[in-house]
């Protein structure tokens, strides 16, 4: 299953499959997730080691048993790949690293006014993988405001150095934020020239294209079909690049198919997995296991659940079958692709779905009336769980926020439905940033069921929590995916990085905002909060957040929206925007429903009709 816990001061011994330099443990974990054989990783921050060569070292590891011995190493961070972790699988990495220079091939230098602009330039350049920016206080005046666009053979820095007044980061192309745009077309009977960066075997051109999209240096590809004239080159997928970023020439060639990486697509990237099953095809590779199962779909599920399995073949040969079950060959290879593809066989083959980010039809947990005042504009995909709950009577308007917690579930505040309990009047918009982008053609979700907490009473602040079951499940994308829930009764975690988001009022007597706003707000102890609200009872099932001096808060229109906190690189839904005295007033923190206290209720209500809990635990 999915394991998200990180091990501080621990290093996994042995099992190395690759090593690289990464700026932090989260990026190292992402590289492990996308590496075909990596199950575990260990990361050495600069502070953990004197050896300059090993600073920022990210070590990717494999293990037949799924685990390795841990040795104590001060400062080291270790953890698991996020394969099988559904919506948490993403190649998108937004963080900016201050005081760090990520080295690589510098192919472009320009003057810009901010690190954000530098990141944008990198995202809009087809060859840029990462960048470094010298701030206005950099020690050498001639380098100040320099934005260096970079690439490397592996897509990660060739070295990382601690350097004052330098900020570094990665291209946001994997976040589907590139302005370049992409070529969706596939060209039959056409072969591209230029430099081959890798060669893999694939059953069709579309798997070839997805592999190209997620390969750090692939910009376009040529696929030689199963009927290509040279037998030894059949099903070969050549991943290619060029200096210009486009093919310098193409040749008409029967039984070849060419196309482009989709990494520069805006708003939508292909999933990093291949769900199609190929009848009459055998995939060769290293044998991991052989099991008898009923049907090719069960074989694929078995492969997906066995974390080291990369692909499979389900044999229908009489000698491989007994009763209704046949042999399911679970296989793997060094690069994650079959080492041999044979056609016209009595098997059906396919790939593990361990990297599919749709996951199952579940809500995400972890084991381990009120808008934003004093906030700033959010950017695309920054808060992909945020939804807008709108009511359409004669006109349509935004009333509340909410949080996507599963394919078919939204968590919000019960008071949003005061006087409006009819599910037909509600429209739920997900994957949006600007309310003004909503037109009559914008897709929205309708409500199947509103589940208000049984102990909630109108005009009282207690148990202000409600679940919405959507009529149809939503697909996950970089802009629309769920937030993980805390573990039940989560009291031990100290959250220091918490944010509230919403389209609500920007001042007490204001109006709904167009762009989703965000504000960083510290949590306040319940004792402190109770002192500020002596006329109200602040219960253990509430959490408070705000600045003593005020100025930043949720406000009208943010109700039901998320209070999220980042811990160990993972966002969790800590609170639901509920109530407060005015907005952003001095010594009047915002009050939020404490989600951890309602985990039993959420689990009970989100159980599917067949009684199977729709909670997925990544830990």
């Amino acid at each position: 299953g999915c394991l998200t816990q990180l091990y501080e001061n621990a290093f996994f011994r042995g099992g190395d499959v690759a090593s690289m330099y990464t700026p932090n443990a989260q990026y190292c974990q992402m590289r492990c997730t996308f590496h075909p054989r990596c199950l575990l990783f260990s990361f050495l921050p600069a502070s953990s080691i004197n050896d300059m060569e090993k600073r920022f070292g990210c070590f990717l590891k494999d293990s037949v048993t799924g685990t390795l011995p841990k040795v104590h190493r001060t400062g080291a961070v270790s953890g698991h790949s996020l394969k099988q972790c559904g919506h948490q699988i993403s190649a998108c990495h937004r963080d900016i690293y201050k005081g760090v220079d990520m080295r690589g091939v510098n192919f472009n230098v320009s003057k810009v006014s901010s690190v954000e602009e530098c990141q944008k330039r990198c995202t809009s350049n087809i060859r840029c993988q990462f960048f470094s920016y010298a701030t206005q206080t950099f020690h050498k005046a001639e380098y100040r405001n320099n934005c260096l666009l970079k690439y490397s053979p592996g897509g990660t820095p060739t070295a990382i150095k601690v350097l004052s007044n330098v900020e570094s980061g990665f291209s946001l192309k994997p976040c589907a934020l590139s302005e370049i745009g992409c070529h969706m077309n596939i060209f039959q009977h056409l072969a591209f020239s230029d430099v081959d960066v890798a060669r893999v075997l694939t059953p069709d051109a579309f798997v070839c294209r997805t592999i190209c999209t997620y390969h750090p240096n692939c910009l376009f590809f040529t696929f030689y079909t199963n009927v290509w004239k040279i037998e030894s080159q059949r099903n070969v997928c050549l991943l290619k690049t060029s200096e210009s970023g486009t093919p310098s020439s193409s040749t008409p060639q029967e039984n070849t198919i060419s196309g482009y990486s989709l990494l520069t697509c805006k708003r939508t990237l292909p999933e990093p997995c291949h769900s199609k099953i190929y009848p009459g095809v055998d995939f060769g590779g290293e044998e991991l296991n052989v099991t008898f199962v009923k049907g090719v779909n069960v074989c694929q599920e078995t492969c997906t659940k066995m974390i080291r399995c990369q692909f499979f073949t389900y044999s229908l040969l009489p000698e491989d079958c007994k009763e209704e079950k046949c042999k399911c060959f679970l296989r793997l290879s060094m690069d994650g692709s079959p080492t041999r593809i044979a056609y016209g066989t009595q098997g059906s083959s396919g790939y593990s779905l361990r990297l599919c980010n749709t996951g199952d039809n579940s809500v995400c947990t972890t084991k381990t009336s009120t808008r934003i005042v004093g906030g700033t504009n959010s950017s695309w995909g920054e808060w992909p769980w945020q939804v807008s709950l709108q009511v359409k009577l004669t006109a349509q308007r935004h009333l509340c926020g909410g949080s996507l917690i599963g394919h078919q579930w939204v968590l919000t505040a019960a008071h949003c439905f005061d006087g409006l309990p009819l599910q037909d009047v509600w429209r739920i918009y997900s994957g949006i940033l600007n309310l003004s982008d909503i037109t009559k053609d914008t897709p929205f979700s309708q409500i199947k069921e509103i589940i208000i907490h049984q102990n909630y009473k109108v005009s009282e602040g207690n148990h202000d929590i409600a679940l919405i079951k959507l009529q149809a499940p939503l697909n996950y994308t970089e802009f629309q995916k769920p937030i993980c829930l805390p573990s039940k009764g989560d009291t031990s975690t100290i959250y220091t990085n918490c944010w509230v988001t919403g389209w609500g009022f920007s001042k007490e007597k204001g109006e709904i905002q167009n762009i989703l706003q965000k504000v960083n707000i510290p949590l306040v102890t319940n004792e402190e909060c109770q002192k500020r609200y002596q006329d109200y009872k602040i219960t253990q099932r509430m959490v408070c957040a705000g600045y003593k001096e005020g100025g930043k808060d949720a406000c009208k229109g943010d109700s039901g929206g998320p209070l999220v906190c980042k811990h160990n690189g993972m966002w969790r839904l800590v609170g639901i925007t509920s109530w407060g005295e005015g907005c952003a007033r001095r010594e009047q923190p915002g009050v939020y429903t404490k989600v951890a206290e309602y985990m039993d209720w959420i689990l009970e209500k989100t159980q599917s009709s067949d009684g199977k809990a729709q909670m997925q635990s990544p830990a």
Epitope: N185, I186, D204, A205, F206, P270, G344
Partner: antibody, heavy 119, light 107 residues
């Protein structure tokens, strides 16, 4: 030029049998998966049966399973559909088609042969 | 089996019009969706493969889009020879199922 030419259709009584043939030319027949697709009068397209390039793997729609048999002779570049226990609802134009695995599409179709099942 | 739902089942349009036909799969089929054109009394012809790719020889006024469960075929500047029935078909999971078809006729 790729060509697929069906033959063997005609009028048959319910419960009767018929064998359709499809002669292929203009491509290496033994390297492609092939299939039969039918279309009842005034209705839509319905996949009937598929066969792998070597003939080892065969697939059937539930509506014809146990009654129809798909086969091929790669030495003769010919695809067959043996239809037994025919029913009135099997009345349709039967198309022979080539499956292009690499692009995951049916890229060439024959002109079709009409099978009428009636007493 | 994966069900394919097409809409509308028929439509009337004039030469020069822009026509849009939608196809919805009962479960995700990634990008494995094809569009075929069938003129009266003729065999079907492949127009678009893998959701958005124009088959060789097909005029560029035909275009396709979509992924997952929802797909669209668009015909820009409708020509007299485009009056026909259009079928979507998924090639993701056996059996390869077709949509019921959309008949485009002259207004």
């Amino acid at each position: 030029e790729v060509q697929l030419l069906e033959s063997g259709g005609g009028l048959v009584q319910p419960g009767g049998s018929l064998r359709l043939s499809c002669a292929a030319s203009g491509f290496t027949f033994s390297e492609y998966d092939m299939m039969w697709v039918r279309q009842a009068p005034g209705k839509g397209l319905e996949w009937v049966s598929s066969i792998g390039s070597s003939g080892g793997m065969t697939y059937y729609a539930d509506s014809v399973k146990g009654r129809f048999t798909i086969s091929r002779d790669n030495s003769k570049n010919t695809l067959y559909l043996q239809m037994n226990s025919l029913r009135a609802e099997d009345t349709a134009v039967y198309y022979c088609a080539r499956d292009q695995v690499a692009a995951a599409a049916i890229d060439y179709w024959g002109q079709g042969t009409l099978v009428t099942v009636s007493s | 089996d994966i069900q394919m739902i097409q809409s509308p089942s028929s439509l009337s349009a004039s030469v020069g019009d822009r026509v849009t036909i939608t196809c919805r799969a009962s479960q995700s089929i990634s990008g494995y969706l094809n569009w075929y054109q069938q003129r009266s009394g003729k065999a079907p012809k492949l127009l678009i493969f893998a959701a958005s790719n124009l088959q060789t020889g097909v005029p560029s006024r035909f275009s396709g889009s979509g992924s997952g469960t929802d797909f669209t075929l668009t015909i820009n500047n409708l020509q007299p020879e485009d009056f026909a029935t259009y079928y979507c078909q998924q090639s993701h999971t056996p059996p390869k199922t077709f949509g019921p078809g959309t008949k485009v006729d002259i207004k």
